[in-house]
């Protein structure tokens, strides 16, 4: 190696100035005993390096970029051999920002795969390798005291989000959570979430279901429907609050809201509908009065309204 | 502190009804779904029937399915267990119990014994 | 219906023993698993629910783990006060069921 670079950071600020230093060994004596040392930048020379012969014999050439505007360069020191540029060596250069602190950190707990699983937003592009790290802890108060610490989570790459599996969570008992983001350049921490996992649990809708007709129970009149649903056992001993959305199949209609329900009615009937008309029915669910997260909304279900009561006209005949 | 207090278990005959109450202090009541479970001599936990905390869902074994009715009175803080068509195999300690929201029977009662014989 | 079976039905151990008790669901039940703890003329105890959470009050030599068939209970150094009859419960389904007991002895 004849050459060799060293720069005052090979990670700056997007915009900031770099520094830069190739010095040319003595001992390369096939090379032009005052060589000049010239510098590039990706595919671009850059002018204003600075040489000079040290004492030891050796050649320096100092460059400042005044800004490094590049996200990612090659700055690189070469000699003009022959025709051609000799490069010497040369270094990767990487700008970009610190972490933004992340924001809208929140948490769901899912109970059939006992995980607490949080999500945020990580801000604008860094232009550098960041890495995001969900960090808690267990607290028996407001989170004011720290508890044990709960083992990092750590996203795949490219994810905004982790899963706390339940061996580290504890139910009814608040959490610290926070995301702290780091790069070369800085580390930044969102604010910090203090829950009780169940108060961010998420359960599964009922399921819909058409009201099986009874023979002694009277058939729904016009514009009316009868349907029931089924609760999500691994839930049920919640306390629910539900509501129903409907639309007709046809038409550009929008949902119309009806609730809220107690998840224990079990069985409604839908009045105020279109007669002789298909309508598209969904149901969700949140914990309540306690805290929680609305369901997502269950499977249609697709049911007709009946016909119109027919009425009487009298007709007149003429002879 | 949670309390709970079952009464009204004795010594009936076979085919003899028996009305199970369980009265409750310390929490709200209305909030939580409410069980009974048994135990026979000897033996281990076996869940007879559950209740919402309104009321509207009440689910069975299928041992005493058609013979027993769950009921609650939230006015009145208490849990009831009809019993109908009584058996020598319902012959146990029956424990009132308070539920959690995962299931879990958080309370109990001391328990009343329900002995059906002849 | 979802069967509990559990293992062994009965066990001798010595004080500062540490024991484990395994409870085996017939079908998946993710977490929702209990433990209880019963002594002769009373009534049972809330240790474990939902797999591994310790119930206020309950000392911290009792932990449970597993999920959705295998679960255990353990005790991590046998007490006393321990020796009992333990008792899973599934509560993810309707109808619930609780396991046929173990009880731990006096060797």
């Known amino acids: 190696e004849c050459g060799h670079i060293s720069v005052s950071a090979p990670i700056v600020h997007l915009g900031d100035p770099i520094t830069a230093s190739c010095i040319i060994k003595q001992n390369c004596s096939h090379l032009d005993p005052e060589p000049q040392i010239l510098w590039r930048l990706g595919a671009e020379l850059q002018p204003g390096g600075r040489q000079q012969r040290l004492s030891d014999g050796t050649q320096e050439s100092i460059i400042t970029l005044p800004h490094l505007n590049h996200t990612q360069a090659f700055l690189s020191c070469a000699l003009n051999w022959g025709n051609s540029l000799q490069i010497l060596d040369q270094v990767e250069l990487r700008a970009g920002y610190p972490p933004a602190i992340p924001h809208n950190l929140s948490c769901l707990m899912n109970l059939t795969t006992s995980s607490l699983i949080c999500q945020w937003e990580p801000g604008p592009e860094t232009h550098l390798p960041t890495s995001f790290t969900l960090k808690s802890f267990k607290s028996r108060g407001n989170c004011q005291t720290q508890g044990d610490s709960i083992l990092d989570c750590v996203p795949k790459d490219g994810q905004s989000h982790c899963s706390i599996p339940r061996k580290h969570l504890l139910l009814y008992q608040n959490m610290g959570i926070w995301v702290q983001a780091e790069n070369a350049l800085g580390t930044s921490m969102s604010p910090q979430l203090c829950l009780d996992p169940m108060d961010v649990v998420k359960l599964e809708p009922p399921m819909l279901r058409t009201m099986d007709p009874s023979p002694e129970a009277a058939p729904p009149q016009a514009g009316c429907l009868q349907l029931s649903w089924e609760p999500w056992q691994p839930g049920l001993h919640i306390n629910q609050k539900c509501e129903l959305r409907h639309k007709p199949q046809r038409g550009e209609a929008s949902w119309a809201l009806v609730g809220p329900l107690p998840l224990e009615a079990l069985q409604y009937e839908l009045c105020g509908l279109l007669p002789a008309t298909a309508y598209t029915l969904q149901i969700r669910c949140i914990r309540w009065p306690l805290p929680g997260h609305w369901s997502d909304w269950s499977p249609s279900l697709e049911l007709r309204t009946t016909e119109r009561a027919p009425t009487h006209h009298h007709h007149h005949h003429h002879h | 502190e949670v309390q709970l207090l079952e009464s009204g278990g004795g010594l009936v005959q076979p085919g003899g009804s028996l009305r199970l109450s369980c009265a409750a202090s310390g929490f709200t009541f209305s909030l939580y779904w409410m069980g009974w479970v048994r135990q026979a001599p000897g033996k281990g936990l076996e869940w007879v029937s559950s209740i919402s905390s309104s009321g509207g869902v009440t689910p069975y074994a299928d041992s005493v399915k058609g013979r027993f009715t769950i009921s609650r009175d939230n006015s009145k803080n208490t849990l009831y267990l009809q019993m109908n068509s009584l058996r020598a195999e319902d012959t146990a300690v029956y424990y009132c119990?308070?539920?959690?929201?995962?299931?879990?029977?958080?309370?109990w009662g001391q328990g009343t014994l329900v002995t059906v014989s002849s | 219906d979802i069967q509990m079976t559990q293992s062994p039905s009965s066990l001798s151990a010595s004080v500062g023993d540490r024991v484990t008790i395994t409870c085996r669901a017939s079908q998946g039940i993710s977490s929702y698993l209990n433990w209880y703890q019963q002594k002769p003329g009373k009534a049972p105890k809330l240790l474990i629910y939902y797999a591994s959470n310790l119930q206020n009050g309950v000392p911290s030599r009792f932990s449970g783990s597993g999920s959705g068939t295998d679960f255990t209970l353990t005790i991590s150094s046998l007490q006393p006060e321990d020796f009992a009859t333990y008792y899973c419960q599934q509560s993810m389904w309707m109808p619930i069921f609780f396991g046929g007991g173990t009880k731990v002895e006096i060797k």
């Open positions: 119990a308070k539920l959690g929201e995962l299931g879990q029977y958080m309370g």
